[in-house]
């Protein structure tokens, strides 16, 4: 566990010609705030895909009014750091999105108006516990200067916040084979000798490879809480107690959501649904009124004139959450056809089509026959994003360029002999059979199962199959 910290140093016009107009005016004073979104790895995700590592919103900056005729200066910034707590290991590589938002403070109906001023994004490698890294990013004519770092929360240490430190048991030195925990020299690196998977919160070990449970926990890895309602809770380090097991703890155990927020588990971690008046990763930000512009994504704020009265965000279609901060998963309906990949960009759905398909929902099957000829009188048939040739008799292969052997499939029945012919095949039937493929027996009395043979053909003669 740890915290990613972002410090915004300046936001203003970038170098070069074409300085941007000030986002604020005497008629429309405004103030800035920032949003950061973090994702693990260096993946090429859509900007609007979930902030799996977390997200944070800054406070509002000071109100700024443009001085008439003056160029747009660096704009006044909010105080403090943006902090994104992360629950698990720090991934080392991450993607970030930093958005600069403008809040207009004119006399809008329903509270202040919001608009996105700039968005920058990047991918970085960063070890936890290292120094501040400085960065400059440009978005159009704007320039954003910032620093960032990742730091571990005790007792975690290390570049991924996965090593644990414990206070020294002896004042002078660490135990055998254990190093001091830099930079916490008064602490020692915890021995990683317990059984693999042993719960760091509810288990401990005194011998390598064991996992002993604290009171109230059981199971081989001390991950199963002991129910006190149906049995006696054993004192001290427990063993598994029959009939007393309930499901093991999840990310919502102990409810990490503050201020009455409700917790729901996600595949990676947890998500808090906050009551009105609170927001943030753990519903920790409070005292919000409509004047603070708490409704994201064009949501309309109603009520909440003072910090003690609740506000309500009326969300536009496609957004939800107490602050309209969450997008409805429209891709779950799988609108993209033919195996296309769905991307929900908020303002629109996009489909990334597989080869051979096009259109807003990959609904057009591209005609791969265009510009491709099938040889020797073959006709092109399109389907599935690929073309194939339906070949004329006597030809085969992808483009009908290969001369087919019509006898390869042994088409002549009852021992008839097959002869390739320029326009097909000819079967020479064995005695007692007739027909184009020798499929009809000749009856012993001389009559056949067919009407009389066509003039000029006697039973037993080769029959040409056209």
């Amino acid at each position: 566990a740890g915290v990613f910290e972002l410090q915004i140093h300046s936001f203003g016009p970038g170098p070069g010609p074409g300085a941007p107009r000030s986002p604020c005016s005497a008629r429309l004073p405004c103030r800035l705030f920032f949003r950061v979104c973090l994702k693990p790895g260096l993946s090429e995700e859509a900007a609007e895909s979930p902030c799996a590592l977390g997200a944070a919103l800054s406070a509002r900056g000071p109100v700024y009014t443009e001085q008439p005729g003056a160029p747009a200066p660096d704009l006044p910034l909010p105080d403090g750091l943006l902090q994104v707590p992360f629950r698990d290991a720090w991934p080392g590589t991450f993607s970030f999105i930093i958005e600069t938002w403008r809040e207009e403070l004119g006399d809008q109906i329903g509270g202040p108006a919001w608009s996105l001023l700039a968005r920058v994004a990047g991918r970085r490698r960063l070890a936890a516990g290292g120094p501040w890294a400085r960065d400059i990013q440009r978005a159009g004519a704007w320039e954003l200067r910032f620093s960032y770092r990742a730091r571990c929360e005790p007792p975690a240490v290390g570049t991924a916040c996965t090593r644990l430190c414990r206070p020294r048991s002896a004042p002078s030195r660490c135990g055998p084979g254990l190093r001091p925990c830099a930079p916490l020299e008064d602490e020692c690196e915890a021995p990683l000798v317990c059984r693999a998977g042993c719960s760091p919160e509810h288990g401990f070990c005194e011998q390598p490879g064991e996992c002993r449970c604290l009171e109230g926990w059981t199971g081989p890895l001390c991950t199963v809480p002991v129910s006190t309602s149906s049995c006696l809770s054993p004192r001290g380090p427990s063993s598994a107690t029959t009939g007393c097991l309930v499901p093991g703890p999840g990310p919502c155990d102990g409810n990490p959501c503050a201020n009455g927020g409700s917790c729901s588990e996600t595949p990676r971690s947890f998500e808090c649904t906050c009551p009105r008046g609170f927001y943030g990763l753990r519903c920790e930000v409070s005292g919000v009124t409509c004047a603070d512009g708490p409704c994201f994504n064009g949501g309309l704020c109603v009520g909440g004139a003072d910090p003690d009265s609740a506000y309500i965000c009326h969300c536009p279609p496609g957004f939800q959450g107490s602050n309209c901060e969450k997008r409805v998963d429209r891709c779950s309906l799988q609108p993209c056809r033919n195996g296309g990949l769905c991307l929900d960009l908020g303002h629109a759905l996009r489909c990334r089509c597989r080869a051979g398909f096009a259109g807003p929902r990959c609904e057009h099957d591209l005609d791969d026959c265009a510009g491709r000829a099938c040889a020797n009188g073959g006709t092109c048939v399109e389907g599935g994003g690929a073309h194939r040739c339906s070949c004329a008799l006597g030809f085969g292969g992808r483009d009908c360029r290969e001369r087919a052997d019509p006898c390869a499939a042994r088409p002549c029945a009852h021992g008839g002999r097959c002869y390739a012919h320029f326009s097909g095949l000819v079967c020479a039937c064995a005695p007692g059979y007739m027909g184009a493929r020798c499929e009809f027996p000749v009856h012993p009395d001389g009559a056949s199962a067919l009407p009389a043979a066509p003039p000029g053909l006697r039973p037993g003669d080769p029959q040409r199959y056209l």
């Epitope: 429209r330 309906l333 799988q334 609108p335 993209c336 056809r337 807003p360 609904e363």
Partner: nanobody
Framework: EVQLVESGGGEVQPGGSLRLSCAAS????????MGWYRQAPGKQRELVAG???????KYAESVKGRFTISRDNAKNTVYLQMSSLRAEDTGVYYC??????????????WGQGTLVTVKP
């Protein structure tokens, strides 16, 4: 502009049934995908059942075997037959449609929602 009008919501006892309807009207060239989402109090809006862009039916795990989605293409309408209703099925049910308004232009539309309450 396309309108989606839902109907059929109401209050029912556990184990009971309801049938929701959603009719699409307006400038519709064709309907690409259409289905039902629900939003329970304090929860996220989630897909319940729908017809995908490829015309397949899709159901949330929690409703499989209890809910059935059907459609009348001539009327641009989808139906959700809900049986063996449970308390956790309570919520506002929203119709959603991904609609081609002409051959190459498609947009997503939501209905206003219809409330389903399951209580003894």
């Amino acid at each position: 502009e396309v309108q989606l009008v839902e109907s059929g919501g109401g209050e029912v006892q556990p184990g009971g049934s309801l049938r929701l309807s959603c009719a699409a009207s307006g400038s519709i060239f064709s309907i690409n995908a259409m289905g039902w989402y629900r939003q329970a109090p304090g929860k996220q809006r989630e897909l319940v059942a729908g017809f995908t862009g490829d015309g397949m039916t899709k159901y949330a795990e929690s409703v499989k075997g209890r809910f059935t989605i059907s459609r009348d293409n001539a009327k641009n309408t989808v139906y959700l037959q809900m049986s063996s209703l449970r308390a956790e099925d309570t919520g506002v049910y929203y119709c959603a449609a991904d609609v081609f308004t002409d051959r190459d232009h498609v947009d997503w539309y939501w209905g206003q929602g219809t409330l389903v309450t399951v209580k003894p």
